[in-house]
């Protein structure tokens, strides 16, 4: 059984076996279909979801689709069910927290008064000022705490304590790419972790330890990625991977968190990067340990520089790395986080690709995760 | 685009009232505070109070205190100050200024070109 | 009542130059402080809030900095179009206050 499990799949209706390698190769090989229907999936990046989250103490922002102008929603008259459209229009399903916090003297957007029209967010066009002077912080979903705070420090050994949402993503048992936990469901990776493999039978997750083989596995139920983009081949490199069963939340298993829409971080911002991938470039073999390193964001133009990327970067990646070289993510770290803390940890970049393993001029190159909340969140309100 | 027009100068006797009114257009006239500041000749500017054209709720300086009325008519997106018992000092240009966004403490953006107000005997 | 004192009351200055205007309040105002720009027989009009936020539209060799009590409207070279009066207001407390005014004139 095991062994036909490994390299043989089970076509229904009539029953027979298929190659394993038939699977998820674009040809139809089982009679209905079933050889291309568990397969690493792409969906579009969809409309602009018309709601949205500040830095600004994770305040609420709504969009006017009439005029296109977003506007932060004024306290008065907020109510948990309003919360709740807030969050489900984002694609979260668990039970949100909000609270009113003072309008500050730079508040930029206008503030309106929130109503709900068909299950969305809608400005009430009757309201009068915002009496309360209050805007609405909403929090979805309670993530980015860890038990542990890390020392700042060159790269060491890290505990689950302070990173319980890593994930190690696995193919034949085999560590492929680190992952994040973003809410019960959902696991937060880089899309080219599933170029040799796209079905999604063989993959599995693995929660809850910082030691490789230690933890047990998780079925997934299904892979997401964005649509191909020839003009920006290296663009798009995110992947969401749907677990089969919602994972239950403990000090060593937790979420965490997405940026805010306006997360801007400077050059010299420190980050912080985890993972069991190489040690050294180009050999080595795979830390059994989980390790993390503290890093800076790298300002892009020095990233796209002559010595370094070349205008590879695009607006929709990152850089970040030490200047001197020498801490950086690797072969296996692949799809883990990137990550950034304020009040809580949020995950702004997935490990996506570079030239080696920190060199000086060329540091990593990670996802910026703030340009496809969007994406996030229309995949998120598809598997609702 | 928003526009506040005032309406014209007006010449006054003490102890008289005088009514100046400010349409607004543009925008949705109940959803920001209206606030009426003024100007004596060569002075600097004085504010008076504010009106939420909502729920025509005002809030008045001390200063003007028993002698100022701020009203509003919802159906013509109109805001009145009213002001008795004229003195001569009262002489000045008055504006309304609608404020930038829509809370209380938001500074005003928009200005009406002003009413020049002449207490005169 | 919160008084806001600006300084000087007025200044010469020519086209090119840095100019720099005070304001003090009475109190904290934390930066509950606007900037105005009025022109003779015009409105006043809105250059900075929040003590250093740029009003969109307005050029940006306008800036503003301070918090607290004091205050500064710096206009980082002077143009023929900006020679008018300068107003500081509070928004922290009823009733709103206006600083007396600087008059900027050209030298």
């Known amino acids: 059984k095991v062994i036909l499990d490994k390299y043989y799949f089970l076509c229904g209706q009539p029953l027979h076996f298929i190659p394993r390698k038939q699977l998820c190769d674009g040809e139809l090989d089982c009679p209905l279909g079933e050889d291309e229907e568990h397969c690493v999936k792409s969906f579009p990046e969809g409309p602009a979801v018309a709601v949205r989250l500040s830095k600004d103490r994770s305040t609420l922002q709504v969009l006017d689709s009439a005029t296109g102008n977003w506007f932060s929603a004024c306290f008065d008259n907020f109510t948990e069910a309003l919360a709740e459209t807030a969050c489900r229009q984002m694609g979260y399903s668990s039970k949100p927290t909000f609270r009113a916090v003072e309008i500050g003297p730079d508040q930029d957007l206008d503030v309106v008064e929130i109503t709900e029209n068909s299950q969305e967010l809608r400005m009430r066009n009757s309201s009068g000022p915002c009496l309360s002077g209050s805007l609405v912080s909403l929090h979805c979903l309670a993530c980015g705490k860890s038990l542990k705070t890390p020392r700042v420090v060159g790269v060491e050994e890290a505990s689950v304590d302070s990173w319980p949402w890593q994930v190690s993503i696995q193919y034949d048992k085999q560590h492929v790419c680190g992952g994040s936990i973003l809410d019960p469901h959902w696991v937060l990776t880089a899309a080219h972790c599933f170029r040799k493999h796209t079905d999604v039978f063989n993959w599995k997750v693995r929660a809850g330890s910082d030691k490789l083989g230690s933890f047990p596995s998780l079925a997934v139920a299904k892979i997401i990625i964005i649509e191909f983009n020839p003009m920006y081949p290296k663009d798009n490199d995110i992947a969401l991977m749907k677990l089969q069963f919602p994972l239950t939340f403990s000090g060593t298993v937790r979420p965490i968190c997405l940026p805010f829409f306006d997360e801007e971080l400077t050059p010299a911002t420190p980050l912080w990067i985890i993972g069991w991938g190489f040690t050294k470039q180009n050999g080595g073999k795979m830390s059994d340990i989980l390790l993390q390193a503290s890093v800076q964001v790298i300002d892009s133009t020095r990233c796209n520089a002559d010595d370094a990327y070349q205008g590879e970067v695009t607006e929709k990646m990152m850089c970040a790395g030490i200047p001197e070289g020498g801490v950086d993510t690797c072969q296996g770290d692949s799809g883990g986080p990137l990550m950034y803390q304020s009040d809580q940890w949020h995950v702004v970049g997935i490990v996506s690709w570079g030239y080696g393993c920190g060199g000086p001029s060329t540091p990593g190159v990670y996802t910026k995760v703030s340009a496809y909340l969007n994406w996030i969140y229309n995949v998120w309100k598809a598997e609702l | 685009q928003v526009q506040l027009v005032q309406s014209g100068a007006e010449v006054k006797k003490p102890g008289a009232s005088v009514k100046v009114s400010c349409k607004a257009s543009g925008y949705t006239f109940s959803r920001y505070f209206m606030h009426w500041v003024r100007q004596a000749p060569g002075q600097g500017l004085e504010w008076m109070g504010w009106?939420?054209?909502?729920?025509?709720?005002?809030n008045y300086a001390q200063k003007f205190q028993g002698r100022v009325t701020m009203t509003r008519d919802t159906s013509t997106s109109t805001v009145y100050m009213e002001l008795s018992s004229l003195r001569s000092e009262d002489t000045a240009v008055y504006y309304c200024?609608?404020?930038?966004?829509?809370?209380?403490?938001?500074?005003?953006?928009?200005w009406g070109q002003g009413t020049l107000v002449t207490v005169s005997s | 009542d919160i008084q806001m004192t600006q300084s000087p009351s007025s200044l010469s200055a020519s086209v090119g130059d840095r100019v720099t205007i005070t304001c003090r309040a009475s109190q904290s105002i934390s930066t509950w402080l606007a900037w105005y720009q009025q022109k003779p027989g015009k409105a006043p009009k809105l250059l900075i809030y929040?003590?250093?936020s740029l009003q969109s539209g307005v050029p940006s060799r306008f800036s503003g900095s301070g918090s607290g009590t004091d205050f500064t409207l710096t206009i980082s070279s002077l143009q023929p179009e900006d020679f008018a009066t300068y107003y500081c207001?509070?928004?922290?407390?009823?009733?709103?206050?206006f600083g007396q005014g600087t008059k900027v004139e050209i030298k």
């Open positions: 207001q509070q928004s922290y407390g009823f009733p709103w206050t």
């Open positions: 200024a609608r404020v930038r966004i829509g809370w209380l403490q938001s500074p005003p953006l928009y």
């Open positions: 929040a003590a250093s």
């Open positions: 009106i939420n054209p909502n729920s025509g709720g005002t």
